[in-house]
Interface confidence: low
């Protein structure tokens, strides 16, 4: 999906009213520094499309994040502000959908987790550079 | 307990408006998205509007695009839904449903209201 | 815009199994809501997200979803049971919230 044409302050909206709050309790108990940032965006869309990777496709030993509630309301924020996003193009849907019962939050989801915050963060500082 | 009352229908003639509403209590309504569906005499489920939870989005059934407005007050826990051009195939029980979650479209709907009767005839 | 498809009516023994289908595009993609109303009263969410239940609803009560074929299992069928079920979808496409035609399902 081409996130060019989204409404990109709509979805800093939704995203400073709960989406990082979910992302935050999500990390309670670790610190900023026990995980380094390793993924990055160059713009808006970008910061998107790598957001959207790592919430709704599992890796191997990160299965179980797109049931989150941060990822449902992300799901929904890209939904509504992201003309033409259609559920069906997320790779993750099944996995999303069933929500399968939650298993123990492992290192690698909570790494993963400290990375989705960082391209969240890079995508409100692009907002700001470009306004 | 969580619960909808819907009030304001009645019998109208084809042309002119009603306005309905759904008292909310029990639950934060305000985190709430919410929606109204029908249902005509002896007749499906039809999904009329929707409105987000802040009421920054509203969509609407096809149906009644550009005759009906959802509205709500979360200060006093209340959604409407404006409905004007009324029409024969109006007539329906309308019923006020909360989304579980935060996203008012993903989810199903777990608390209905009881509905009221919409009769519109000359 | 997308369209759900159930049968008219099913019919069920006492303690026999019924299983009401909902037909739709690709639902397997979807997340599949289902609801029982019975006779003058307001519908009742039994089933979400293709197989979830609330809490006040029976483990009799159960669901699947895949392919083009949504289905609601109701085992050990009771007179109770009798009502009106629908399926129930978000059209992303659209935006649109999507119910079936609706199943009458008899307890005989």
């Known amino acids: 999906y081409d996130f060019t044409n989204c409404d990109f302050q709509k979805i800093e909206a939704d995203y400073l009213r709960t989406i990082s709050k979910d992302l935050i309790t999500y990390m309670s108990g670790t610190k900023s520094t026990d995980f380094n940032n390793t993924v990055s965006c160059s713009n808006r869309p970008h910061c998107l499309t790598e957001i959207q990777s790592l919430t709704f496709n599992p890796t191997p030993r990160c299965a179980s994040l797109a049931k989150e509630m941060f990822a449902r309301k992300t799901k929904a924020t890209l939904a509504l502000w992201c003309p033409g996003y259609s559920e069906t193009q997320i790779n993750a849907t099944q996995a999303m959908k069933k929500r399968r019962k939650r298993k123990v939050t492992t290192n690698k989801c909570l790494e993963q987790v400290s990375q989705l915050l960082g391209l969240w963060r890079r995508f409100i500082r692009t907002l700001l550079k470009k306004q | 307990q969580m619960q909808l009352v819907e009030s304001g229908g009645g019998v109208v003639q084809p042309g002119r408006s009603l306005r309905l509403s759904c008292a909310a209590s029990?639950?934060?309504?305000?985190?709430?998205?919410m929606h109204w569906v029908r249902q005509a005499p002896g007749k499906g489920l039809e999904w009329v509007a929707v409105?987000?939870?802040?009421?920054?989005?509203?969509h609407y059934a096809d149906s009644v695009k550009g005759r009906f407005t959802i509205t709500r007050d979360n200060s006093k826990n209340t959604l409407n839904l404006q409905m004007n051009s009324l029409r024969a195939e109006d007539t329906a029980v309308y019923y006020c449903?909360?989304?579980?979650?935060?996203?008012?479209?993903?989810?199903?709907?777990?608390?209905w209201g009881q509905g009221t009767m919409v009769t519109v005839s000359s | 815009s997308y369209v759900l498809t159930q049968p008219p009516s099913v019919s069920v023994a006492p303690g026999q199994t019924a299983r009401i289908t909902c037909g739709g595009n690709n639902i397997g993609s979807k997340s599949v809501h289902w609801y029982q109303q019975k006779p003058g009263q307001a519908p009742v969410l039994v089933v979400y997200?293709?197989?979830d239940r609330p809490s006040w609803i029976p483990e009799r009560f159960s669901g699947s979803n895949s392919g083009n074929t949504a289905t609601l299992t109701i085992s050990r069928g009771e007179a109770g049971d009798e009502a009106d079920y629908y399926c129930?979808?978000?059209?992303?496409?659209?935006?649109?919230?999507?119910f079936g035609g609706g199943t009458k399902l008899t307890v005989l």
């Open positions: 449903a909360r989304s579980p979650q935060w996203e008012s479209i993903f989810e199903a709907f777990d608390i």
């Open positions: 029990g639950f934060t309504f305000r985190t709430y998205g």
């Open positions: 409105i987000w939870y802040d009421g920054s989005y509203t």
């Open positions: 129930q979808v978000w059209d992303s496409s659209s935006s649109l919230v999507v």
């Open positions: 997200d293709d197989s």
